[in-house]
């Protein structure tokens, strides 16, 4: 049934009337509003735009928007004693030092609290030693350099350029090796496109560009000084020694131009092979050490950053629903950045300014959706997605009881070639409806729809005339509620074409040149995709609160299910003769799996069947729609993260960014032919097999019928 | 804008070092090496050498370890190269000129360069 | 030292003529990563020499597009579509892979 069918409609208040309110000068304006100066998570100038947003908010018409505070764990540089990095000579002399700051942009020379480049919760320190380049750091990295170059970190400092992977699996993995200490660089192979200038001139990263960024492993904990727990006002706060997830070696990024002055000079072996070569003119050797001439040298860091327990504040706003108040579809995305958030978040917050205020509209026109919407401006996701989890924590019981979907809303582009989005699969039909209704603002495609222009730009690599939708990782605020509690949960964003890149990030990522001029001169001069992201958040929103069946298809989940233990098994069988000896069997995962599409085939018929009028049958069948993502979740939560709790879906273990299916079953199997005890290893993949199995099978259950 | 300013010309007697300034502006000083270049009259190009202006390293063409010193002013963002003990052989425009680091590796903004007579 | 050979050292043309200069290097410029740092540069008659083409094919900003690199390895071409009274002067090609050296120039000229 379409949404007009919900309460207290008239023809006029429908999916249209709510899209077509939405407009690209509004969200141009609201971007430049929140990007003239930064909004650093702590800072008075963050706190007044939050109190600006509430304002305008209630303005537009929600029925209430409260601030949400709380004091966590943040991390500044010490204004007085910078950051920095060295080259010392043999007498221990600074013979060149990493710059201070970045060359502001024009127009901003005289903006002040730009937050230099730094890695965020990095430990004081100032560690001194020979550099080791590390390519990604990325797991195989150092598989490649301590297994197969036979190449010792210990006691290094280790130089690695970001990209592939998050920054904060990087420095764990160094950690890992023995390193001292870990300097970031983005390199032009990940950060420059070939033909483009550099910004101001272009949307590509200048020598000088660095991008900022948390370096936690915080595995979905929040705050690291209460996790589980909100950080409210008698909080009982871990000592910053069992404080989750911070690094414990020194961490600092810096641009190109600095790292090429410490690149060129090293020596030692060669690198193994291209894919550990970038574009900067230097030999890319490993080390350790430098060459010949500079063999004498070390390298020095100097961090003097502090941890601080700071107040942060989120904004609320609610429209309440007509019919099921008690039924909750939120739009979130954060508010806070590194600078001035140009594009992260603030293309993303811009969007959701326009969508409240359309909802905003409609509402004063007598309009109400069938459930409720809450809109949230979070706080501090730069420092670990701290204020969007703390409110999760602090209303954990409702959100479970509740929490229908979550749909995110951080930046709005990283490129301008197609649509991007990740979702639980409940969502993909929703998402192919939608798009199919929405026209593409992509050139060529005038008057074909987006559904059309993403699925040729962006093919499913599994079915064809479909586009491709990921699985949903992190490193962004839907994670505590699809990770931890199992709401369904979306994202939606214009991406480049730039497959290979995925986790990279966009050349100006976290870095001062994130400004309103690079969106409007270089991404979005018309804020077509801007708007076209907002009608896809948008519109995915107003369908989850006001279809009267949920609009998720469970059979979909089916689907995947079977492709992710096809993928799974073909992983284990990897290992034939270990399968054998420990009777590794994954017959009770299929099994599981077969039973889950079974049912979820007839739950579909019922769903097509049954009397909507009758609004008790209604309430039952949508509370096993909501129910269903939260049957995946395990509440003993995964080996050694137990705030990752989904069973189906996690962040990676080796890229934060990446989503994982059967993460259980796959950190079992992973590098399984290195483990000392196989048999201890093998039994815990068998474990494994059987909480997946469980899981799904008791997934499969909550759809039977009822009695 | 980049800009490197050199002064026109410089008269020097044999033996007598010189000393050849540059000046930038427009940019960011200590990112970027400098070069400098010699033309002799009727000439082609020849490379002498660079100096970073962030740590001061310097790299010099083999042909030209004895005979130029190069070095750097980063208060005032000036680079500077001593001739020493120049000849009449030594007599030529002296250019010095950026290298634009990545994705360029080439000398991509040039001063209009220092004629230098050496003559008794 | 990398030797780079220029031909012709002369080149007469006509005003809307295609010109072709070469630059032979005595060894590969192709750096190990990937990248081929061969450059070209323009005097024109009482000026500095201005960058034109950098890493053999790539036109610097401001260049028009009548002026087009090719080559790999040892051998590079630098083209100019449609010649205009402004393009005459001393063409030189330059390479940074190794310790940075010049070709010995060509002038382009009217015929």
């Known amino acids: 049934k379409s949404s007009n069918e919900a309460t207290n409609i008239t023809p006029k208040h429908n999916m249209k009337a709510f899209l077509d309110e939405l407009k690209a000068e509004n969200i141009k304006k609201f971007l430049y509003n929140f990007t003239q100066i930064p909004h650093l998570a702590g800072t008075e100038q963050n706190f007044q735009l939050a109190k600006q947003i509430q304002s305008q908010w209630k303005e537009f018409g929600l029925d209430s928007v409260e601030l949400a505070h709380y004091d966590v764990l943040l991390s500044y540089p010490n204004k007085t004693h910078p950051n920095y990095i060295s080259i010392i000579n043999e007498d221990g002399n600074e013979i060149f030092n990493t710059s201070l700051f970045e060359p502001p942009p024009p127009g901003y020379e005289n903006v002040s609290d730009i937050v230099p480049p730094f890695s965020a919760f990095s430990p004081q320190g100032m560690p001194e030693g020979d550099l080791v380049y590390v390519n990604y750091a990325r797991t195989e990295d150092f598989f490649k350099l301590e297994r197969d170059m036979k190449i010792n970190c210990s006691g290094k400092i280790v130089i690695a350029r970001y990209g592939k992977v998050f920054r904060g699996n990087k420095v764990k993995n160094a950690q890992l090796a023995g390193a001292k200490g870990v300097i970031l660089y983005s390199d032009p192979a990940d950060y420059f496109a070939p033909g483009v200038k550099s910004y101001p001139d272009g949307w590509n990263l200048p020598g000088g560009g660095v991008q900022r960024g948390n370096i936690l492993n915080l595995n979905g904990a929040g705050d690291p000084l209460t996790p589980g727990y909100p950080a409210n006002e008698y909080a009982y706060r871990r000592g910053i020694a069992e404080a989750v997830g911070l690094p414990s070696i020194p961490v600092h990024p810096i641009g190109y131009y600095d790292a090429q002055k410490l690149l060129e000079k090293m020596g030692g072996s060669a690198p193994p092979d291209s894919s550990w070569r970038g574009s900067l003119k230097v030999p890319y050797n490993v080390g350790p050490g430098f060459t010949g001439n500079f063999s004498t040298q070390k390298v020095k860091m100097h961090i003097h950053s502090t941890n601080e327990v700071t107040r942060i504040y989120n904004v609320i706003g609610t429209l309440r629903g007509a019919v099921e108040p008690d039924r909750y579809v939120i739009l979130g995305g954060h508010r806070d950045s590194w600078v001035f958030g140009g594009i992260d978040p603030q293309s993303g917050a811009a969007v959701v300014h326009e969508i409240v205020r359309s909802f905003g509209t409609l509402k004063k026109e007598g309009w109400r959706p069938r459930r409720t919407i809450l809109f949230a401006s979070w706080d501090a996701e730069e420092f670990g997605l701290l204020g969007s989890t703390e409110w999760a924590e602090e209303n954990s019981r409702l959100l479970q009881e509740r929490g229908v979907a979550y749909i995110n809303a951080d930046s709005s582009i990283e490129g301008n070639y197609t649509l991007r989005v990740d979702c639980t699969p409940l969502m993909y039909s929703l998402v192919h409806n939608l798009t199919k209704e929405l026209k593409s603002p992509d050139e060529g495609f005038e008057g074909k729809s987006l559904y059309e222009s993403w699925t040729k730009k962006s093919p499913s690599p599994e079915f064809s005339g479909m586009p491709r939708i990921s699985k949903l990782g992190s490193g962004n605020d839907f994670e505590v509620f699809f990770q931890r509690l199992g709401i369904a949960s979306g994202r939606a964003r214009y991406t480049k074409n730039w497959e290979t890149n995925k986790f990279s990030g966009y050349p100006l990522y976290h870095s001062v040149y994130e400004t309103y001029e690079l969106v409007e001169k270089f991404y979005d001069p018309m804020f077509k995709y801007h708007l076209t992201v907002a009608q896809v958040r948008g519109g995915m929103v107003f369908e989850l609160a006001n279809s009267i069946v949920l609009p998720f298809d469970c059979r979909d989940y089916a689907v995947v299910l079977r492709k992710y233990a096809d993928k799974i098994y073909s992983i284990s069988m990897k290992h034939p003769q270990e399968m054998k000896t420990y009777s590794v069997s994954f017959d009770s995962l299929f099994s599981a799996v077969k039973n889950f599409t079974e049912i979820a085939s007839k739950f579909s018929e019922r769903l097509q069947d049954f009397d909507k009028s009758n609004p008790i049958v209604l309430r039952m069948m949508n509370d096993q729609l909501m129910f269903l993502e939260r049957a995946f979740i395990d509440p003993l939560g995964l080996p050694d993260r137990p705030f990752y709790r989904h069973v189906i879906y996690a962040p990676s273990s080796h890229n934060k960014y990446a989503g994982e299916s059967f993460p259980g079953i796959y950190d079992a199997l992973f590098d399984i032919e290195s483990k000392v005890d196989p048999s201890k290893a093998w039994g815990e993949v068998k474990r494994q097999i059987y909480v997946a199995a469980f899981t799904v099978q008791a997934a499969a259950e909550t759809l039977s019928e009822v009695a | 804008s980049v800009q490197l300013q050199q002064p026109g010309a410089a008269l020097v007697r044999p033996g007598a070092s010189v000393r050849l300034s540059c000046k930038a502006s427009?940019?960011?000083?200590?990112?970027?090496?400098m070069n400098w270049v010699m033309q002799r009259p009727g000439q082609g190009l020849e490379w002498i050498g660079m100096?970073?202006?962030?740590?001061?390293?310097?790299r010099l063409s083999q042909k030209f370890r004895d005979k130029a010193t190069l070095t750097v002013d980063k208060s005032s963002s000036t680079v500077y190269m001593q001739l020493n003990s120049p000849t009449s052989d030594d007599s030529a425009v002296y250019y010095c000129?950026?290298?634009?680091?990545?994705?360029?590796?080439?000398?991509?903004?040039w001063g209009q360069g220092t004629s230098v007579t050496v003559s008794s | 030292d990398v030797v780079l050979t220029q031909a012709p050292l002369s080149l007469p043309v006509s005003l809307g003529d295609q010109a072709s200069i070469s630059c032979r290097s005595s060894?590969?410029?192709?750096?190990?990563?990937?990248?081929?740092?061969l450059h070209w540069y323009l005097q024109k008659p009482g000026q500095s020499p201005e960058l034109l083409i950098y890493?053999?094919?790539n036109r610097f900003s401001g260049v028009p597009d009548r002026f087009s690199g090719s080559g790999s390895g040892t051998d590079f071409t630098l083209k100019i579509h449609r010649v205009e009274a402004e393009d005459l002067g001393v063409y030189f090609c330059?390479?940074?892979?190794?310790?940075?050296?010049f070709g010995g120039g060509t002038k382009l000229e009217i015929k």
């Open positions: 000129a950026r290298d634009g680091n990545f994705p360029y590796y080439a000398l991509d903004y």
């Open positions: 427009g940019y960011s000083f200590t990112y970027y090496w």
């Open positions: 100096i970073h202006p962030s740590d001061s390293e310097t």
């Open positions: 060894q590969s410029l192709e750096y190990s990563n990937g990248n081929t740092y």
């Open positions: 890493t053999v094919s």
């Open positions: 330059s390479q940074s892979t190794h310790v940075p050296t």
